[in-house]
Interface confidence: low
Amino acid sequence: FKVATPYSLYVCPEGQNVTLTCRLLGPVDKGHDVTFYKTWYRSSRGEVQTCSERRPIRNLTFQDLHLHHGGHQAANTSHDLAQRHGLESASDHHGNFSITMRNLTLLDSGLYCCLVVEIRHHHSEHRVHGAMELQVQTGKDAPSNCVVYPSSSQDSENITAA
């Protein structure tokens, strides 16, 4: 399977909400011994590999923001902790998963990574990630709503095997 990032750049005004999205593509095993773990974290564009550094989003780690379920089941974070920080991660039946960030500030600008780990219990694991940039702007040059820029076909499938 692969992870696609439909948009590589989100440009938003301060105070707005934004939903960053990734999509799981390709064949997904729905067997009982297979679980998918999806999460989000901040990173920086490393020289060797994007998303290799894992930093918290608004002080919440990837562990706080994770989703886990079999196959394409829907899931979302209901944790008070995430919601208190204006965050919610969610996943639907079609392989889309997202993180919603409310009331954006300039400090939210940066590189965001989605990560999927497929675990075949007691056997193997496979992980893929996607990256996207969030720019939060203020002042007269800021857009009135979030503007999203589609990924190039090359960027939209960012594959990292375990």
């Epitope: 679980t35 773990y37 999460t39 894992r54 780690t61 990837f62 562990q63 706080d64 994770h66 886990h68 209901s78 944790h79 008070d80 902790l81 780990v117 675990i119 075949r120 219990h121 007691h122 056997h123 193997s124 694991e125 992980r127 375990a162």
Partner: antibody, heavy 120, light 107 residues
Framework: QVQLVQSGAEVKKPGSSVKVSCKAS????????ISWVRQAPGQGLEWMGG????????NYAQKFQGRVTITADESTSTAYMELSSLRSEDTAVYYC?????????????WGQGTLVTVSS | DIQMTQSPSSLSASVGDRVTITCRAS??????LNWYQQKPGKAPKLLIY???SLQSGVPSRFSGSGSGTDFTLTISSLQPEDFATYYC?????????FGQGTKVEIK
């Protein structure tokens, strides 16, 4: 069958450090959270922190922040817990425990425990 | 941190008795509640996860129920090997926290 085998008992002086190891065998190591839980004599269970080896970053209970370091070596399927500035109240059995499903935090596999005694 | 409170802290029962242990969380934890059994000198053993799911290999006389803040572990017919200490644990958010334990003793 998954097994977690911990290092042997330790006797330490107050102010020193101890490093306990937990070697996993029989299953995928990297994607499962390994936590450390301690139990003082006659007391209940206390979670110290955990790590998911593929990430390498650990999550600690506030009580132990700054004193505990949890690491994992994927090449040897071994997790480590180091506790510094030991005091007598750190005398306890230290368990490593593995989550049953990746990043969930219920523990279906436990090490046998390592008794750490802090005494001058 | 989420506080977990178990009751009773100890109880005396006879073989064949129905035993109920309760666990209360200081805030809603949905169904992120696990139960463990521990015998002296041994590591804890997972009995119930996700409030009501029986762990593989655990006898069906053990059952769990509840959601939100109030949870129950029930042993339908106490067996000699069930005399032990039982702990609840929330896995809703870190730091993970355990109840103080309930010791089940022979009457």
């Amino acid at each position: 069958q998954v097994q977690l085998v911990q290092s042997g008992a330790e006797v330490k002086k107050p102010g020193s450090s101890v490093k306990v190891s937990c070697k996993a065998s029989g299953g995928t190591f990297s994607s499962y959270a390994i936590s450390w839980v301690r139990q003082a004599p006659g007391q209940g269970l206390e979670w110290m922190g955990g790590i998911i080896p593929i990430f390498g970053t650990a999550n600690y209970a506030q009580k132990f922040q700054g004193r505990v370091t949890i690491t994992a070596d994927e090449s040897t399927s071994t997790a480590y817990m180091e506790l510094s500035s030991l005091r007598s109240e750190d005398t306890a059995v230290y368990y490593c425990a593995r989550s049953s499903y990746g990043w969930s935090y219920e523990f279906d596999y436990w090490g046998q425990g390592t008794l750490v005694t802090v005494s001058s | 941190d989420i506080q977990m409170t178990q009751s009773p802290s100890s109880l005396s029962a006879s073989v064949g008795d129905r035993v109920t242990i309760t666990c209360r969380a200081s805030q809603s934890i949905s169904s992120y509640l696990n139960w463990y059994q521990q015998k002296p000198g041994k590591a804890p053993k997972l009995l119930i996860y996700a409030a009501s799911s029986l762990q593989s290999g655990v006898p069906s006389r053990f059952s769990g129920s509840g959601s939100g803040t109030d949870f129950t572990l029930t042993i339908s017919s106490l067996q000699p090997e069930d005399f032990a200490t039982y702990y609840c644990q929330q896995s809703y958010s870190t730091p993970l926290t355990f109840g103080q334990g309930t010791k089940v003793e022979i009457k």
